[in-house]
Amino acid sequence: KFSKQSWGLENEALIVRCPRQGKSSYIVDWYYSQTNKSIPTQERNRVFASGQLLKFLPAEVADSGIYTCIVRSPTFNRTGYANVTIYKKQPDCNVPDYLMYSTVSGSEKNSKIYCPTIDLYNWTAPLEWFKNCQALQGSRYKAHKSFLVIDNVMTDDAGDYTCKFIHNENGANYSVTATRSFTVKDEQGFSRFPVIRAPAHNETKEVEIGENTNLTCSACFGKGAQFLATVQWQLNGNKITDFSEPRIQQEEGQNQSFSNGLACVNTVLRIADVKEEDLLLRYDCLALNLHGLRRHTIRLSRKNPIDHQSTYC
């Protein structure tokens, strides 16, 4: 229930967040799950705990394993597990699937590639970017904050992109790399006011308490490559990132598809272990481009309102 996979490469920094979140003021203790041995908080240690974060500076293959974090609230202690795997550096340029973060899609006019997990680190711009292990050079490539923008994207821009940055911890520098695939949709066309395909406006979706559910926000923006075409979820009018509930996550990046020649973008809101409170929230699917903003609202309702007992404990 409160477990998360994390991975990294040996001799690089890896920072992992406790899957069991709480208020920032809460003390968090970390342990090696197998030995129950406490992980130190002193920064002179190679592996040390810093609040909700567990830091491997740098990581070693032998660090692989399950780590327990205990969030100490004023009432009860709440436990989470981080499943960490550290891999040996690959001798060749190939990045195996198990080291890849989620794939992102782009087009001629929408080509942002975000650097995964970077928000956990203390880094300074600019990022270094590589495609299929070659450093990106030329004015087409612009490293902006935590993402890469490619001008005039072409189909052969598809490939594996690696961001490399330096994490600084008390004056010491550690390298971090993260790789994800980028796919390109190349087509000429037109742009129009967004049309939301899903959900229908004021739709109600039946869910089971205790189960997981996904909500898809899908909109079409015209034909061919689009400039500034984005879809996102909001909860009660707030950004997902402003809503501090780890069970509710919007998938990173957006998937672009072409339906009957139309350029459509979708993003999925994943709700784990649905709770009664989630039924009280308003879920807004927002579609935005240069023509304007369209919003469709969906609410959740209980599938079996009578004598429903969750089988999830």
Epitope: R20, Q21, G22, K23, S24, S25, V71, S73, P74, T75, F76, R78, I209, G210, S244, E245, P246, K275, E276, E277, S310, Y312, C313
Partner: antibody, heavy 121, light 106 residues
Framework: QVQLQQSGAELVRPGASVTLSCKAS????????LHWVKQTPVHGLEWIGT????????VYNQKFKAKAILTADKSSSTAYMEFRSLTSEDSAVCYC??????????????WGQGTLVTVSA | QIVMTQTPAIMSASPGEKVTMTCSVS?????MHWYQQKSGTSPKRWIY???KLASGVPARFSGSGSGTSYSLTINNMEAEDAATYYC?????????FGAGTKLELK
């Protein structure tokens, strides 16, 4: 929707004990800590303590450690508070309550209707 | 235990008036919750995590503060806002409440 249904008013003699109940519905009972709060005109709102219905673990306000016992019955999704050795000082409205999202301790979002306890000879 | 001091204990305001009540804390806390209670009813969560409005709370309400000083403000007092407001800390056990500020309609 989330509901906390409390038992009815109690008139009890000094020195006696009373057990108040709080039946939870509309959510998974074992997913949330349940708290008890006492309200009097003199002392206002006072937190008595909390129980984790999943494990039965409890945390008490030291002031009420000898006064209250919190229990929970998973099978009926009901929490109980036994109030012992009652004096006139214990006359109060007692509420059961819980947070909106458990891990974030984001305030008592759901309250029972309250049970009036009157201690009188 | 953390002691919460609410001021004023009682206040009155006319419709349209700006109202501010404060909650002072004996030792620093990270967040503050506020509840509204009307006579004969259970308290309602009104503002949580210092500044977030609970569901259904009008936008004329706001909360602010840090450390040992927090406040609740109503920008344009309305008749329905007449009630008692309590602050509460969830920083350390035991959880504690303020004695309340009773807001009356002038």
């Amino acid at each position: 929707q989330v509901q906390l249904q409390q038992s009815g008013a109690e008139l009890v003699r000094p020195g006696a004990s009373v057990t108040l109940s709080c039946k939870a519905s509309g959510y998974t009972f074992t997913d949330y800590e349940l708290h008890w709060v006492k309200q009097t005109p003199v002392h206002g709102l006072e937190w008595i303590g909390t129980i984790d219905p999943e494990t039965g673990d409890t945390v008490y306000n030291q002031k009420f450690k000898a006064k209250a016992i919190l229990t929970a019955d998973k099978s009926s999704s009901t929490a109980y508070m036994e109030f012992r050795s009652l004096t006139s000082e214990d006359s109060a409205v007692c509420y059961c309550t819980r947070a909106f999202y458990n891990d974030y301790d984001d305030g008592f979002a759901y309250w029972g209707q309250g049970t009036l306890v009157t201690v009188s000879a | 235990q953390i002691v919460m001091t609410q001021t004023p204990a009682i206040m009155s305001a006319s419709p349209g008036e700006k109202v501010t009540m404060t909650c002072s804390v004996s030792s620093s806390v990270s967040y503050m919750h506020w509840y509204q209670q009307k006579s004969g009813t259970s308290p309602k969560r009104w503002i949580y995590d210092t500044s977030k409005l609970a569901s259904g709370v009008p936008a004329r309400f706001s909360g602010s503060g840090s450390g040992t000083s927090y406040s609740l403000t109503i920008n344009n007092m309305e008749a329905e806002d007449a009630a008692t407001y309590y602050c509460q800390q969830w920083n350390s056990s035991p959880l504690t409440f303020g004695a309340g500020t009773k807001l009356e309609l002038k």
